[in-house]
């Protein structure tokens, strides 16, 4: 018996060939011997089966001895053994129809779980193997669960259902709602304007919700809300902003915030959350601000950084065009009685300069 696998909602063609390449009598029946379709004279006739309005045949191939049955808009309950009667012989074809669906919205927040459920005919014992856009392989039976979706899981998932050495492939588009980056750090000299950007890793026709940036300044004992905003059809409007600092926000996506001045008291880390309408949970992006200040006071030249820096970062004071350098894996470096000239304060990570500030030391007479 030939086995054919079909997909729910798709069209399947069950083939039946006569030995002689000519038009002849044929019938398709189901396992209960109820006629589905056949030929009477030169015309296609349909029986009283439930398939009658969805079953058809390729009339153009009849004179070549091909008497296939096409079933449109397949349903799980169409799974059955179908019998083709032609030239006093019977050909049996077992049709197994499967459906694979995400049993929740296919637009999911990062960290949420995705469950794919296989609909299958009674008596079947299929296996399912799914491959994520990032190449992750997951296997299962009637259900496949991906517990913690990551942003790289966005895209088309390809799932293969196997039964009796036959396979059928499903493609499911999953959109993981997340920011492009989980975390970002902005390095600025004191007084410079700061730009924070929060690009999304997805696009939606309508994007509505609300967001907030909570900020924990390094020098403050507690965090506070810097800005609360509204998002309506990709248009951004500020609902509430703290007085100090007075952030500005772009009116269009990507979400864009401007801090007029980088000051030591603002250095720290923030958490931008975005709650989307009709979605449970929130999108998060962490943002850090590191501020550098170089100062000369009497005989002391000091360079300091504030904000979340890793212990492996190096802070250096260096006299331009001279070898004089002081370097530390610390948040402050200083030189007593510095030589006159242009000094550079550098914050670097394994030789890569993240932030630099110049300060001119004038000779003292």
């Amino acid at each position: 018996k030939k086995v054919v696998l079909g997909k729910k909602g798709d069209t399947v063609e069950l083939t039946c060939n006569a030995s002689q390449k000519k038009n002849t009598q044929f019938h398709w029946k189901n396992s209960n011997q109820i006629k589905i379709l056949g030929i009477q004279g030169l015309f296609l006739t349909k029986g009283p089966s439930k398939l009658s309005d969805r079953a058809d045949s390729r009339k153009s191939l009849w004179d070549q001895g091909c008497f296939s049955m096409i079933i449109k808009n397949l349903k799980i309950e169409d799974s059955d053994t179908y019998i083709c009667e032609v030239e006093n012989k019977k050909e049996e074809v077992e049709l197994l129809v499967f459906g694979l669906t995400a049993n929740s919205d296919t637009h999911l927040l990062e960290g949420q779980s995705l469950t794919l459920t296989l609909e299958s005919p009674p008596g079947s014992s299929p296996s399912v193997k799914c491959r994520s856009p990032g190449g992750k392989n997951i296997q299962g039976g009637r259900t496949i669960s991906v517990p913690q979706l990551e942003r790289q899981d966005s895209g088309t998932w390809t799932c293969t259902v196997s039964q009796d050495q036959k396979t059928v492939e499903f493609k499911i588009d999953i959109v993981v709602l997340a920011f492009q980056k989980a975390s970002s750090t902005v390095y600025k000299k004191e007084g410079e304007q700061v730009e924070f950007s929060f690009p999304l890793a997805f696009t939606l026709e309508k994007l509505t919700g609300s967001g907030e940036l909570w900020w924990q300044a390094e020098r403050a004992s507690s965090s506070k809300s810097w800005i609360t905003f509204d998002l309506k059809n990709k248009e951004v409007s500020v609902k509430r902003v703290t007085q100090d600092p007075k952030l500005q926000m772009g009116k269009k996506l990507p979400l864009h915030l401007t801090l007029p001045q980088a000051l030591p008291q603002y250095a720290g880390s923030g958490n931008l959350t975005l709650a989307l309408e009709a979605k449970t949970g929130k999108l998060h992006q962490e943002v850090n601000l590191v501020v550098m200040r170089a100062t000369q006071f009497q005989e002391n030249l000091t360079c300091e950084v504030w904000g979340p820096t890793s212990p492996k970062l190096t802070l250096s004071l260096k006299l331009e065009n001279k070898g004089a350098t002081v370097s530390k894996q610390a948040k402050a470096v200083w030189v007593l009685n510095p030589e006159a000239g242009m000094w550079q304060c550098l914050l670097s990570d394994s030789g890569q300069v993240l932030l630099e500030s110049n300060i001119k030391v004038v000779p003292t007479w």
Epitope: G209, S225, T228, R240, T242, Q243, A275, E277, T280
Partner: antibody, heavy 119, light 107 residues
């Protein structure tokens, strides 16, 4: 544990004044907007006023504008509502409430203090 | 000012019933809507903010839906402790306004 405790309510004659206080604990008071909401006996809730984290921004319902003043003292974790030119229709239980999170909802409420305006 | 109209003003229901309370805003408020529960002699308790975000610790039988001007609070299977008055409140623009309340009573 977040706690809000109101005080200062009482019986006052029409045209009189009262000062309501709300003592906050269990959270960083200076990081939150705060509101006053009142409820007349047997009636529904009515939002009265709110104030931002540092006290520089205040909003009021029209019926109390020019008569009520909201203020805060972050050093003392205290919220106040000064009630002047009181009317009979100001009789209510006055609750202070914290505004929490990005949807600006009132996530913690005090038990309230009763203000009765009657001659 | 934005008017908030709740319906019904009271509803009689039995334990296990599904209860829907609707709230209509006189102008669009997007999702800036909260639902509160108040029991006699008690302080109001926040159930839902952002029209549909359940507050932590609130049972999952409570759910909120809607956007713009029409909102619904649903209690999927009423429990004895759910008999109370429910208020909606808009935080879209000042002055913030509450609905007049819906009392859920025992049938």
């Amino acid at each position: 544990e977040v706690q809000l405790v109101e005080s200062g309510g009482g019986l006052v004659q029409p045209g009189g004044s009262l000062r309501l206080s709300c003592a906050a604990s269990g959270f960083t008071f200076s990081s939150y907007w705060m509101s006053w909401v009142r409820q007349a006996p047997g009636k529904g809730l009515e939002w009265v006023a709110n104030i931002n984290e540092d006290g520089s921004e205040k909003n009021y319902v029209d019926s109390v504008k020019g008569r009520f003043t909201i203020s805060r003292d972050n050093a003392k974790n205290s919220l106040c509502l000064q009630l002047n030119s009181l009317r009979a229709e100001d009789t209510a239980v006055y609750h202070c409430a914290r505004e929490g999170g990005q949807w600006l909802a009132l996530d913690y409420w005090g038990q309230g203090t009763l203000v009765t305006v009657s001659s | 000012d934005i008017q908030m109209t709740q319906s019904p003003s009271s509803v009689s229901a039995s334990v296990g019933d599904r209860v829907n309370i609707t709230c209509r805003a006189s102008q669009g408020i997007r999702s800036w809507l909260a639902w509160y529960q108040q029991k006699p002699g008690k302080t109001p308790k926040l159930l839902i903010c952002g029209a549909s975000s359940l507050q932590s610790g609130v049972p999952s039988r409570f759910s909120g839906s809607g956007s713009g001007t029409d909102f619904t609070l649903t209690i999927s299977s009423l429990q004895p402790e759910d008999f109370a008055t429910y208020y909606c409140q808009q935080a879209n623009s000042f002055p913030w306004t509450f609905g007049q309340g819906t009392t859920v009573e025992i049938k």
